[in-house]
């Protein structure tokens, strides 16, 4: 009975999410492998989040709106491990918007999800950020490594969206 009711709940939750995501990829996890964590197909998963690389070239504001429509935000990078996971799927000759900006040009960088900006956990390329006119952050490959650079927000770039995993 318990298993039956759990399955019914799961199915109704799945139907609910299918309005927004036509297809979900789920894996069993948890102590007793009773929980399913899902990401929309073809998003990738790492720890408790799902990631989508958008190859559509758009300004920072349009990129954030695009992620928002999908129930996500431009990516907030919290650890080096997370950045290393993300960059496995990026092209080295491209740049991708992050969810990091300095809208007033005061060098007060802020993440789109209001995560506090921690200077000790940043991955700026050497010499960056270097211009208060450039108020949005990208990740790109330079000097043999992935790092962040400040750029003009209205210049179209590819982007990375991030959302919390869906648990059913």
């Amino acid at each position: 009975n318990f298993m039956y009711s759990k399955t019914v709940k799961r199915l109704s939750k799945l139907q609910e999410y299918q309005q927004y995501y036509p297809s979900l990829t789920c894996v069993m996890e948890g102590k007793d492998m009773e929980d399913w964590s899902c990401c929309p197909t073809p998003w990738t998963s790492f720890q408790s989040s799902c990631y989508f690389i958008s190859t559509v070239m758009q300004s920072w504001t349009k990129s954030q709106n695009n992620c928002s429509v999908m129930g996500a935000d431009l990516v907030v990078i919290n650890t080096k491990e997370e950045q290393d996971f993300i960059t496995q799927n990026l092209k080295i000759n491209s740049a991708y918007f992050l969810g990091l900006s300095d809208p007033k040009g005061w060098r007060h960088w802020q993440w789109v999800d209001q995560t506090p900006y921690n200077k000790n956990v940043t991955f700026w390329h050497s010499g960056e950020p270097n211009s208060p006119d450039e108020r949005c952050a990208i990740i790109n490959f330079r000097s043999e490594e992935w790092g962040w650079n400040d750029v003009h927000c209205h210049v179209p770039q590819k982007s990375i969206c991030k959302m919390k995993k869906i648990y059913i």
Epitope: S59, T61, K62, Q64, P103, P132, D133, H154, P156
Partner: antibody, heavy 121, light 111 residues
């Protein structure tokens, strides 16, 4: 008082090259992102190129990409536009302008008087 | 590219009367409460001059008879009481996304 003075315009044959200059005074040039905007005779305004304050990031519309190169010399307070493979449709008055950010966008707040480029055989 | 469509192409207004110019963007140019539309004035033989930025902010030194309004895709420049020195072509411009694009211009004349 901010002054932007363009020079280098003239008559050039199709396929030819020209280098425009814009000498700035009255501003701390090295801290400004700069742009070029053009205006064909009797027509509207078209953005041509932008360069950031350090000169390491440059941006162009598709109409000039690969043919025009924007550059700057901060020690001389001068902005440049190298124009190659010129076409008749590049005929216009070319203005340099200072760029001022506004949150995620920008404005072009100071403009020079312009220099005229004519591409004709 | 974002297309900026201005109307009317030209406008004749009596001195002291109100002049209204419209600008429509092909997609929204708003984000987080700001609109990325600017207005410029260009008098014959002169470069453009910034009047309004961020849809409604009056540039320093510009008379307050000029005002801007709108959001999303629809924007308006208003001259509340036309003066002889306002005869010019007016352009809207979006700075939300490259390439920056301008409207085709509206020529304002005295009736």
């Amino acid at each position: 008082e901010v002054q932007l003075l363009e020079s280098g315009g003239g008559l050039v044959q199709p396929g030819g090259s020209l280098r425009l200059s814009c000498a700035a005074s009255g501003i701390t040039f090295s801290t400004y992102t700069m742009s070029w905007v053009r205006q064909a005779p009797g027509k509207g305004l078209e953005w041509v190129a932008t360069i950031n304050s350090g000169g390491d990031n440059t941006y162009y519309p598709d109409s000039v990409k690969g043919r025009f190169t924007i550059s700057r010399d901060n020690s001389k307070n001068t902005l440049y536009l190298q124009m190659n493979s010129l076409r008749a449709e590049d005929t216009a008055v070319y203005y340099c302008a200072t760029y001022r950010p506004y949150y995620y966008g920008s404005v072009l707040d100071y403009w020079g008087q312009g220099t005229t480029v004519t591409v004709s055989s | 590219d974002i297309v900026m469509t201005q109307s009317p192409d030209s406008l004749a207004v009596s001195l002291g009367e109100r002049a209204t110019i419209n600008c429509k963007a092909s997609q929204s140019v708003d984000y987080d409460g700001n609109s990325y539309v600017n207005w410029y004035q260009q008098k014959p033989g002169q470069p453009p001059k910034l009047l309004i930025y961020g849809a409604s902010n009056l540039e320093s030194g510009i008379p307050d008879r000029f005002s801007g309004s709108g959001s999303g895709t629809d924007f308006t420049l208003t001259i509340s009481s036309l003066q002889a020195e306002d005869v010019a072509v007016y352009y809207c411009q979006q700075s939300d996304e490259d390439p920056w694009t301008f409207g085709g211009g509206t020529k304002v004349e005295i009736k």
